[in-house]
């Protein structure tokens, strides 16, 4: 028969034949042959693989470093990574929670809706049209664009959610 050019789901093509992938929680030891099945082995303690795979090494579980204020929220298994969170009163800097801060800052384009308290983190909101924030801040609200008209000037450059408008002199009509 013709050698396959594509394989079914949960299989992979090697040496012109389709082999079964290893299930989550297991790593590849040897590819299948004409006569043998794919050989897989369970991941060791503190290791995991979360997909059907042909990896020869399992991934190490994430380490929740207490020196960074991290602790284990959910212990990893052979099929899932460890999930870290921050100590009480601290907040993750990102979805991955790789370090902890007392309170998060709002990025440029966002302003502080509510300053952090002992129990809740900073609440950010996008700067609406007519307002901007050009800094990363845990305290500053969005600022209103400068009103060029009140200074007897005209808008030379439009504002954005991250930048103020640029005002300039009105064009004088030449005689």
């Amino acid at each position: 028969p013709e050698p396959p050019t594509a394989c079914r789901e949960k299989q992979y093509l090697i040496n012109s034949q389709c082999c079964s992938l290893c299930q989550p929680g297991q790593k590849l030891v040897s590819d299948c042959t004409e006569f043998t099945e794919t050989e897989c082995l369970p991941c060791g303690e503190s290791e995991f693989l979360d997909t059907w795979n042909r990896e020869t090494h399992c991934h190490q579980h994430k380490y929740c470093d207490p020196n960074l204020g991290l602790r284990v929220q959910q212990k990893g298994t052979s099929e899932t990574d460890t999930i870290c969170t921050c100590e009480e009163g601290w907040h993750c800097t990102s979805e991955a929670c790789e370090s902890c801060v007392l309170h998060r800052s709002c990025s440029p384009g966002f302003g502080v809706k509510q300053i952090a308290t002992g129990v809740s983190d900073t609440i950010c909101e996008p700067c609406p049209v007519g307002f901007f924030s050009n800094v990363s801040s845990a305290f500053e609200k969005c600022h209103p664009w400068t009103s060029c008209e009140t200074k007897d000037l005209v808008v030379q450059q439009a504002g954005t959610n991250k930048t103020d408008v640029v005002c300039g002199p009105q064009d004088r009509l030449r005689a």
Epitope: G69, W90, S99, C100, L102, S105, F139
Partner: nanobody, 116 residues
């Protein structure tokens, strides 16, 4: 390397005043929002005051509003906290920091004890 060194703490009677200073180095001071936090004995960290890079905007926790004043001198890379009408509950180690205030770096604090 970021270095933040708070000083000016001490023993003061209730109703008294103290001025804390924070010497900063290792970063562009005037570009950073700076804060004061404190840790009372057996308690967690409490944010008490913050100031924008320019010094134009200041922020205070309700617990110190009207009594404490934050300021900065960007030419000296120094942050200040003027504390008036001190109370026993203000007793704590005070730390200065730059935003965002990271768990892995608090700098050196200064102890303020309010007692008669």
């Amino acid at each position: 390397e970021v270095q933040l060194l708070a000083s000016g703490g001490g023993l003061v009677q209730p109703g008294g005043s103290l001025r804390l200073s924070c010497a900063a180095s290792g970063f562009t001071f005037e570009e950073e929002e700076m804060i004061w936090v404190r840790q009372a004995p057996g308690k967690g960290l409490e944010w008490i005051s913050a100031i924008s890079g320019s010094g134009g905007s200041t922020y205070y926790a309700d617990s110190v509003k009207g009594r404490f004043t934050i300021s900065r001198d960007n030419s000296k890379n120094t942050l200040y906290l003027q504390m008036n009408s001190l109370r026993a509950e203000d007793t704590a180690v005070y730390y200065c920091g730059k935003e965002p205030f990271r768990f892995d770096y608090w700098g050196q604090g200064t102890l303020v004890t309010v007692s008669s």
